[in-house]
């Protein structure tokens, strides 16, 4: 029980300094201080996707 409680402790009790190095399909989310799955940005004029080009997000459909 104790070990489990440590593993799921509140996010605010953990160090929030340097962003973690994430793998290629992930990026660092400052809100949760961890790597999460990330989608690619999409440049509207070219239609290309890139993790470096900000623009309208490429999504299969609208949000609910």
């Amino acid at each position: 029980m104790g070990a489990r409680r440590l593993r799921v402790r509140s996010q605010r009790s953990r160090d929030s300094s340097v962003p973690t190095q994430c793998n290629q399909t992930e990026c660092f989310d400052p809100l949760v201080r961890n790597c999460v799955s990330c989608e690619l940005f999409h440049t509207p004029d070219t239609g290309h996707t890139s993790s470096l080009e900000p623009g309208t997000a490429l999504q299969p459909q609208e949000g609910s």
């Epitope: 605010r12 962003p19 660092f28 989310d29 400052p30 809100l31 999460v36 993790s51 949000g63």
Partner: antibody, heavy 125, light 107 residues
Framework: EVQLVESGGGLVQPGGSLRLSCAAS????????IHWVRQAPGKGLEWVAW????????DYADSVKGRFTISADTSKNTAYLQMNSLRAEDTAVYYC??????????????????WGQGTLVTVSS | DIQMTQSPSSLSASVGDRVTITCRAS??????VAWYQQKPGKAPKLLIY???FLYSGVPSRFSGSGSGTDFTLTISSLQPEDFATYYC?????????FGQGTKVEIK
């Protein structure tokens, strides 16, 4: 199609407990953070808690800390909000939502893109 | 916790008007601000993320700007379906916090 469906709301007496469920389809919850947000009648949005199922990290609003517990079962693709010691001021529509992230130079640029329909929790004697 | 202060709390406008809603964070949140639209009895909808990026399917009359502590949502030409309540939210530091909302009503 991405979808979030909440269930488990209802009428409960002060001091009572409820467990809300948020069943996800069309995506895997382990890849994102899942949030509970509530809205009291006629009031604004109040964030309640989040869970990052891949690692089990959690955080809570001060107003619910010690009373509510957020969790997730990745095998069922479902998130939960266990609510204990309920108070009249917990009366609200409870929504679950997914936080989407877009990769902007290795950092998340995102927001809550998919929301459930909401489930009403009424705490009254 | 970071406070998000929205203004005005409500406004009356006509179809075709340009509408501006502001949100001020109590500390620097970089560009980690999203804007949502909510209609009565419905779940919120994401409009803008990362302060200025338009979410998929959202009409281009919506735009966002700002960084640090001051943020703006602009509707360039208000349409009948835009009468709703709008919320800002910061997600730079947990806990994520919402503004109190701005209700846009028909004049």
């Amino acid at each position: 199609e991405v979808q979030l469906v909440e269930s488990g709301g209802g009428l409960v007496q002060p001091g009572g407990s409820l467990r809300l469920s948020c069943a996800a389809s069309g995506f895997t919850i382990s890849a994102s953070s899942i949030h509970w947000v509530r809205q009291a009648p006629g009031k604004g949005l109040e964030w309640v808690a989040w869970v990052l199922p891949s690692v089990g990290f959690t955080d809570y609003a001060d107003s619910v800390k010690g009373r509510f517990t957020i969790s997730a079962d990745t095998s069922k693709n479902t998130a939960y909000l266990q609510m204990n010691s309920l108070r009249a001021e917990d009366t609200a529509v409870y929504y679950c939502a997914r936080r989407v992230c877009y990769n902007r130079l290795g950092v998340c640029a995102g927001g809550m893109d998919y929301w459930g329909q909401g489930t009403l929790v009424t705490v009254s004697s | 916790d970071i406070q998000m202060t929205q203004s005005p709390s409500s406004l009356s406008a006509s179809v075709g008007d340009r509408v501006t809603i502001t949100c001020r964070a109590s500390q620097d949140v970089s560009t980690a601000v999203a804007w949502y639209q909510q209609k009565p009895g419905k779940a919120p909808k994401l409009l803008i993320y990362s302060a200025s990026f338009l979410y998929s399917g959202v009409p281009s009359r919506f735009s966002g700007s700002g960084s640090g502590t001051d943020f703006t949502l602009t509707i360039s030409s208000l349409q009948p379906e835009d009468f709703a309540t709008y919320y800002c939210q910061q997600s730079q530091i947990s806990p994520p916090t919402f503004g109190q909302g701005t209700k846009v009503e028909i004049k």
